[in-house]
């Protein structure tokens, strides 16, 4: 979802090893070593160059910056702070750059930053103030509209001794800086749960992608405040059933489209309300593809074709009658 440049001439800069000793900021048409630049497209690409830090001499005209496929490791505070500021930078793609730490204030001094893609980086340490830049209880609003955080979960052995979900949510909520966020992608992060307060504090969301996680339940998640939500991707999770409260909230969102494919739906008596709702609702895309995973006798049955007689629960035996 990051912009790509239109076909236009890219100038590239030969690598140089001398230290940057200057009396003035970079010339407007200067292109950093190991990068390709197009002033016409306002685009700089420093892609697959094994860079270990953000180039210091980025041209002031840059609107779209691609720093993908590098070895940045750490994004320090003020990583993009320049004099003059990179006032035009609107889209920043850092995906696949081996980032494992993003520090507080990493994106400060980027007043026009609308899209940020940190996908495919093993973020073991994402500062709570990575996006807000301040530890104030209410920070200056971030200009971010799209935040792409797909597959940022680090390997198990590199995780801190804290909940990964909690770390990500803390960064999303700090200082209430992301009130203007419209697109949030959190796919493929092994999320087991969604902290209950996260969505309530992102009221501008239009698109939320939580696909390919390990979400088992949405019982404690409220979608009620997300009145602008247009798409909710929940494919490829571990959802067993959606309960009445969730169904009612989703139905109450005026523009919503929900994607629920490839979840292990449990087709027992608890599924009755959801089946009834599915038959009536227009909000679920591809609802005819939803099938049961459990119990065994129901496997691959299409949810829309079930009726209440199909959805039974085995009686719970009193303890005296249970066999070991």
């Amino acid at each position: 979802s990051s912009p790509t440049s239109s076909a236009s001439s890219f100038s590239s800069s030969a690598p140089f090893l001398a230290s940057a000793v200057s009396a003035q900021p970079p010339l407007p048409d200067q292109c950093p070593a190991l990068c390709e630049c197009s002033e016409a497209a306002r685009t700089v690409k420093c892609v697959n160059r094994n860079l270990t830090e953000v180039p210091t001499d980025l041209p002031a005209y840059v609107r779209n910056l691609f720093l993908t496929g590098n070895q940045l490791a750490v994004l320090p505070a003020g990583a993009f702070a320049r004099r003059p500021p990179l006032a035009e930078l609107a889209a920043l793609n850092l995906s696949g750059s081996r980032l494992d730490e993003v520090r507080a204030g990493a994106f400060e001094h980027l007043p026009s930053l609308r899209q940020l893609d940190l996908s495919h980086n093993p973020l073991a340490d994402l500062s709570p103030f990575a996006f807000s830049g301040s530890n104030a209880s209410v920070s200056a609003p971030s200009p971010l509209v799209e935040l792409i955080l797909n597959h940022i979960v680090p390997p198990e052995d590199e995780r801190q001794n804290r909940s990964f979900e909690g770390m990500v949510v803390a960064a999303l909520l700090a200082g209430r800086a992301l009130q203007g966020l419209r697109r949030l992608e959190l796919a493929s992060n092994h999320f087991l749960y969604l902290p209950r307060d996260v969505l309530a504090q992102l009221p501008s969301l239009r698109h939320l992608d939580l696909s390919n996680n390990s979400l088992v339940s949405l019982t404690y998640v409220s979608f009620r405040n997300l009145t602008h939500l247009e798409s909710l991707h929940l494919e490829d999770n571990a959802l067993k059933v959606l309960h009445n409260g969730t169904l009612a909230e989703l139905q109450g969102l005026p523009h919503i489209r929900v994607f629920l494919d490839n979840n292990p739906w449990v087709c027992d008596c608890h599924m009755a309300d959801m089946v009834t709702w599915l038959k009536e609702t227009e909000v679920v895309q591809g609802k005819d593809r939803l099938t049961c995973a459990y119990p065994e006798k129901m496997r691959n049955r299409v949810l829309l074709e079930l009726n209440s007689a199909d959805l039974d629960c085995d009686p719970i035996l009193p303890p005296s009658l249970q066999t070991s």
């Epitope: 230290s19 000793v21 009396a23 003035q24 210091t56 003020g78 004099r83 006032a87």
Partner: antibody, heavy 121, light 111 residues
Amino acid sequence: EVQLLESGGGLVQPGGSLRLSCAASGFDFSRYWMTWVRQAPGKCLEWVSEINPDSRTINYTPSLKDRFTISRDNAKNTLYLQMNSLRAEDTAVYYCARPDHDYNPYYFNYWGQGTTVTVSS
Amino acid sequence: DIVLTQSPASLAVSLGQRATISCRPSQSVSTSSNSYIHWYQQKPGQPPKLLIKYASNLESGVPARFSGSGSGTDFTLTISPVEAEDTATYYCQQSWEIPLTFGCGTKLEIK
């Protein structure tokens, strides 16, 4: 507590050289950009030069870059300013300064007390 | 280079009254989110002390009687009410571009 202590000032003849030092303590010197600012008697403050933590990025005020050289020794927690071909107009109090953040300076929270350089015959 | 013009060059204000100091950069030093102007206080024989960063953000430990405002090419430092200890010279500084530059100061005297 952050402390910056300048030394090396003194009286020097026109055309002579001096090397100023700024000894830093109370913080991780190797993380911070460092800056020299000077103030001629009764005059404005003038930004002189700055150096980034690993000495790879150095900036000077244009009129001084041919005569002044900034450097640092992170092992010794010390910032330097080598001043050559000194002129009467270089007479000033020289301050070293540090921002509160560890990226390129926008403002300066911490200042030394200054060392006085007098260029006179 | 960006030239910062401070006015007045000197100012005498009665104790408890309001002091207003102007700083005008020769070009805009503001983005949509930040203005790159900072204010310092300097007393005789001492180094400058940061009062306000980014035009309006009070540095920690600085009394709330100091405030800053403005954007683009017009900035103001206000001290209200003025106290005796505020006798000093006040400088603005821009960090929009290299070289960083300072204004030539406003000397405040308390009557």
